[in-house]
């Protein structure tokens, strides 16, 4: 290939521009940040402005279609090579909203000129030593930064998994310093707790640094390593709420008292660990859902503390779940459900196998945290009830991929008493048909943290309708 | 197997090849259907000006030639070849020349083919002579350079740290070791032959003549792995550290009162990640290899090592699929009584 | 902005069902329950139960169960209302709401019943 | 079941008046308790949240008070626009019952 991909790519967009300049009159004649004389440094933050703007077609005449596509096209991330990111990044760029609003036509032409200015940046960067002897290409910038965040507990993922580099993590709050984490690491993770613990209130920020594996001195040709910016994170806000757990119940006559466990966090306070509540107070509360054991119809309550008193009618048992939600948030307001717990299980023997199962497949997790199993196991993660039996049944079968793979008696063993839980308890539906249900090998194949937890998914479903 | 030709990178996604090998997109042409002037020739270029990245990198390049009493039509575009395309699925998906093969389709002649190096679907060729089932190597892209799929890449070289230069025995100079440093946490390795330490933290370690060291220890209340970097010319908890120099931290035993303590030292990158206790690691025969592995039906493996307890995974050939239940995992492990090491057979089973 | 359209009124012959839909947009439909609550000509307000589009979980009034059936399209962020079997005094105008847990903070235009012969 | 007892039924009163409704919960619910507005014709507003918090745009002469069993409204100074039925309603446990509403006339 003469030209590499990136050259192609800003080639294709100064067609698309060009394209979309000839529709100009079918574009909604809205005003659009235009970001013009981009200073030196800025170009990448400046293209991803254009990017972002709200370019739309009016819907007007025959071109309606010729110009979503089109706009779609503008829209492609572009290869992030080193030639493209390898510039000093900088935090202090104009943002998108500071920069002069035009309309469509102006907008274009101030797109297309940054574009020719960046391939000119591209042809002469190549003649400035930005490959190394072999002609590869140094290092490619991180990209899809996410956050992960449960309780509190945070971790900075990003990809890709690194070829011939390595990676360097970088966090502060707004206005704070930057601290380093992840020494020149292989993964493509970093747990940030630590930092993020010391102000969950903060909004942090974190980048990530790519180096050559061979010489994690070398840089890019503007002489500094190429680095992306995570998307903000304020944990008090963002933190997802982890899986409450029903600590217990007590009946007193026809009122029953149930608990829920208070989750501890990793936020310390004068050196003891924080539990969640103690965090936030009354800004979380807990939704309970309660149900006799021999029908279906639920009931609800709430309360701001741990506990809940409910009247239940007598000689009946019930079974409970209970969800923490923080109602202030506008989004990862709610927790997934707890386990389902219930009164007098022995009456409800396939309910408690399903339960056990849950235990099991709790116990699994442990075990194989400190294990390098990195199979991939068929997961449907999203069962349609009329397929419940045929999914337990995948994951059954994959679940034997597990214990084949770890090698360890103790997760064998757990394997076979779960295996023969559950076969127990979809026996006792009879041999139920399902048709029309996806085959195991059709189903995406997820790491084992995800399979394990879609398979928590599925017990709960059971749980639920046993 | 050829590495997949390998191109610059597309940060959308990385994905890699069945060798490993990383799979970049694929460059297409990507004119949707356009008329076209192709008729009766063994082989036509596409004129189609657009050369696309394709947005998933394990899209291929398809062209479809149909031709009904109106007018010929010439589609080019990306297409992911574990989905059908005009209800066909891509056979030829990873061939590196784009040659037609006939499909029925009522009421027109309807050609289609896929191919899977750059560009490859801008000369589409009809020829029967064109030998399919032994299509040439040139054509498309060349993956030319070095660092195609199967190499080991070189052991990372870490950059000298100047407050002291150390060689090693052989006058090289000696830079300072990766190790895991998360020192005391708690955990939950027990009864395993191996455990990962859970350490998200690499630490360069400050001095060059720094080895990775790990101890666990188990009393009644609790377990706990430390991680971190020592000079190994001084003792560590009162042990001198023998093992220093292997590069595999293999856990040895020390008497402790009143708690099990194991303790081991290495002096390869981050080595003290996997902690090794299994006592049939042969420490005095680091040497030992496995052969080839063995093959399985409709599968391949690339191996990237075949050193003791390495693990690797066959991949099921394209339009194959593992059987659930099956594992495509085989490892090399040593057999005590004739001291030979051998892959472990897979249980894997790949299915149409 | 937050909005709830609620569908179109309808007119029903007794011992027929009707469907009523609720398109919710501006937030994160999954973060939020959609309660429905009914409201007889010159009469106060009942409530008829609510489902939690994040689980599926669905509570309804004694008086409501085997009358409505509560279901949620998240792929459309549009909740469902089914009420079967009507009779005269299911005539109503019934009303979908956004549940913030400690109110309903955000209400549809409501959707008129009309059960008659 | 909770039942929620609001009182009066109807209400006359002027312009600038200061007026007070109540609602009576037949068992504790803390402070789960809201009060909405409706005009004829029209959906509920939200006024109150938390027997006490104000809605978002909601004008300060509208306030709550109580906790437990015990709750009220006050409205500091009537003003043209206020003239509606009034709600409670407890979101504590299902069903989360309405009271059966004020109707606030102009006197």
């Known amino acids: 290939q003469g030209q590499d991909r990136h050259m192609i790519r800003m080639r294709q967009l100064i067609d698309i521009v060009d394209q979309l300049k000839n529709y100009v009159n079918d574009l909604v004649p809205e005003f659009l940040p235009a970001p013009e004389d981009v200073e030196t440094n800025c170009e990448w933050s400046a293209f991803s402005c254009f990017q972002k703007a709200q370019l739309k077609s009016a819907n007007t005449g025959n071109n309606e279609r010729i110009i979503n596509v089109s706009i779609k096209k503008l829209k492609r991330k572009p290869p992030s090579t080193n030639a493209g990111r390898r510039q000093k990044h900088r935090l202090t760029c104009p943002s998108c909203d500071s920069y002069e609003k035009k309309p469509p036509k102006e907008f274009l032409e101030r797109f297309k000129s940054l574009l020719q200015k960046m391939i000119h940046q591209h042809l002469s960067s190549r003649t400035h030593g930005s490959e190394d002897s072999s002609g590869t290409t140094n290092t490619v910038a991180a990209y899809n930064l996410t956050w992960k965040s449960t309780n509190f507990k945070t971790i900075l993922e990003w990809e890709p998994k690194p070829v011939n580099q390595v990676y360097t993590v970088q966090i502060s709050t707004k206005s704070g310093d930057w601290k380093s984490k992840c020494f020149y690491t292989t993964d493509t993770e970093c747990d940030l707790t630590d930092e993020i613990v010391k102000d969950v209130k903060q909004t942090y920020l974190a980048r990530v640094f790519s180096y050559p594996a061979g010489n994690v001195e070398s840089t890019g040709s503007a002489g500094e390593p190429l680095y992306e910016n995570s998307p903000e994170f304020t944990p008090y806000l963002e933190t997802n709420l982890g899986q409450p757990t029903i600590q217990s119940f007590e009946q007193v006559g026809t009122k029953v008292n149930v608990t829920v466990e208070d989750e501890r966090t990793l936020v310390r306070r004068n050196n003891t660990f924080l539990s969640l509540r103690d965090v936030f107070g009354k800004d979380l509360i807990y939704t309970l859902y309660y149900w006799k054991s021999s029908s279906s119809g639920k009931k609800t309550a709430k309360t701001n503390t741990n506990e809940f008193l409910i009247d239940v009618d007598k000689g009946e048992n019930y079974c409970f779940s209970v969800q923490a939600v923080i109602p202030s948030r506008t989004v990862n307001r709610k927790s997934t459900d707890s386990p389902v717990e219930c009164m007098g299980q022995e009456k409800g023997e396939f309910r408690e196998n399903w339960v056990n199962v849950i235990s099991d497949l709790k116990k699994i997790e442990d075990l194989i945290q400190s294990m390098h199993i990195d199979a991939t196991l068929y997961t449907e993660s999203d069962v349609h009830p009329s397929c419940k039996v045929t999914a337990m049944k995948c994951f059954l079968l994959e679940l034997q991929v597990i214990s084949l793979e770890s090698g360890d008696a103790s997760i064998h063993d757990t394997v076979e008493n779960l295996i023969i839980l559950a076969n127990n308890s979809l026996s006792s539906n009879g041999n139920v048909t399902e048709s029309g249900c996806k085959e195991c090998e059709e189903l995406e194949e997820k790491n084992i943290k995800e399979f394990l937890q879609s398979f928590v998914h599925i017990v709960q479903m059971f749980i639920n309708t046993s | 197997i050829p590495p997949h030709v390998q191109k610059s990178v597309n940060n959308d996604m990385i994905v890699t090849d069945n060798n490993g090998a990383v799979k970049f997109p694929q460059l297409c042409k990507f004119c949707d259907v356009r008329f076209s002037t192709c008729d009766n020739q063994k082989s036509c270029m596409s004129n189609c000006s657009i050369t696309s990245i394709c947005e998933k990198p394990q899209e291929v390049c398809v062209a479809v030639w149909r031709k009904n009493d109106e007018n010929i039509t010439l589609e080019t575009v990306c297409h992911d070849p574990k989905l059908p395309y005009h209800d066909f699925i891509l056979e030829d998906a990873a061939s590196p020349k784009c040659i037609m093969k006939e499909k029925k389709k009522p009421g027109e002649t309807f050609f289609m083919c896929s191919c899977s190096s750059d560009e490859c679907n801008d000369n589409i060729i009809f020829s029967e002579e064109y030998n399919t089932s032994n299509p040439d190597g040139g054509g498309g892209s060349g993956g030319g350079g070095s660092g195609g799929g199967g190499s080991i890449p070189p052991h990372v070289q870490k950059s000298v740290n100047n407050d002291m230069i150390v060689t090693d025995n052989n006058g090289a100079v000696k830079f300072p070791q990766l190790c895991k440093f998360c020192d005391v946490r708690f955990s939950t390795c027990d009864n395993q032959k191996s455990c990962m330490s859970n350490c998200s933290i690499t630490s360069i370690c400050e001095k060059p003549q720094e080895v990775c060291v790990a101890v666990w220890r188990k009393n009644d209340e609790n377990i706990t792995l430390e991680t971190v970097c020592h000079d190994p010319k001084l003792p560590y908890h009162d042990f001198i550290l023998e093992d220093a120099a292997s590069p595999k931290c293999i856990m040895k035993e020390k008497k402790k009162p009143g708690e099990t303590f194991f303790m081991c030292s290495c002096s390869s990158d981050e080595c003290n990640d996997n902690i090794i206790f299994s006592e049939e690691y042969n420490t005095s025969n680091p040497d030992i290899t496995c052969p080839p592995p063995m093959s399985v039906e409709h599968a391949d493996i690339w191996v990237k090592s075949y050193s003791l307890y390495s693990r690797e995974r066959y991949i099921c050939n394209s339009g194959f699929k593992r059987k659930a239940g099956t594992s495509s995992l085989t490892e090399c492990v040593l057999n005590k009584a004739t001291n030979v090491a051998h892959w472990t057979t897979p249980s894997l089973k790949c299915i149409r | 902005q937050i909005q709830l359209v609620q569908s179109g009124g309808e007119v029903k012959k007794p011992g027929a069902s009707v469907r009523v839909s609720c398109k919710a947009s501006?937030?994160?439909?999954?973060?939020?329950?959609v309660y429905w609550v009914r409201q007889s000509p010159g009469k106060g307000l009942e409530w008829i139960g609510y489902i939690d589009p994040y689980n599926g979980i669905t509570i309804y009034d004694q008086n409501f169960k085997g009358k409505a059936t509560l279901t949620v399209d998240k792929s459309t962020s549009t909740a469902y209302m089914e009420l079967s079997s009507l009779r005269s005094e299911d005539t109503a105008v019934y009303f979908c709401?956004?549940?913030?847990?400690?109110?309903?903070?955000?209400w549809g235009q409501g959707t008129t019943v009309t059960v008659s012969s | 079941d909770i039942q929620m007892t609001q009182s009066p039924a109807s209400l006359s009163a002027s312009v600038g008046d200061r007026v007070t409704i109540t609602c009576l919960a037949s068992?504790?619910?803390?402070?789960?308790l809201a009060w909405y507005l409706q005009k004829p014709g029209k959906s509920p507003q939200l006024l109150i949240y938390?027997?006490?918090n104000l809605a978002d745009g909601v004008p300060s002469r509208f306030s709550g008070s109580g906790s437990g069993t015990d709750f009220s409204f006050t409205i500091s100074s009537l003003q043209p626009e206020d003239f509606a039925t009034y709600y409670c309603q407890q979101v504590y446990s299902s069903p989360f019952t309405f009271g059966q509403g004020t109707k606030l006339e102009i006197k």
């Open positions: 501006g937030y994160s439909f999954t973060d939020y329950n």
């Open positions: 709401a956004r549940d913030v847990t400690t109110a309903l903070d955000f």
């Open positions: 938390a027997a006490t």
């Open positions: 068992q504790t619910i803390d402070t789960w």
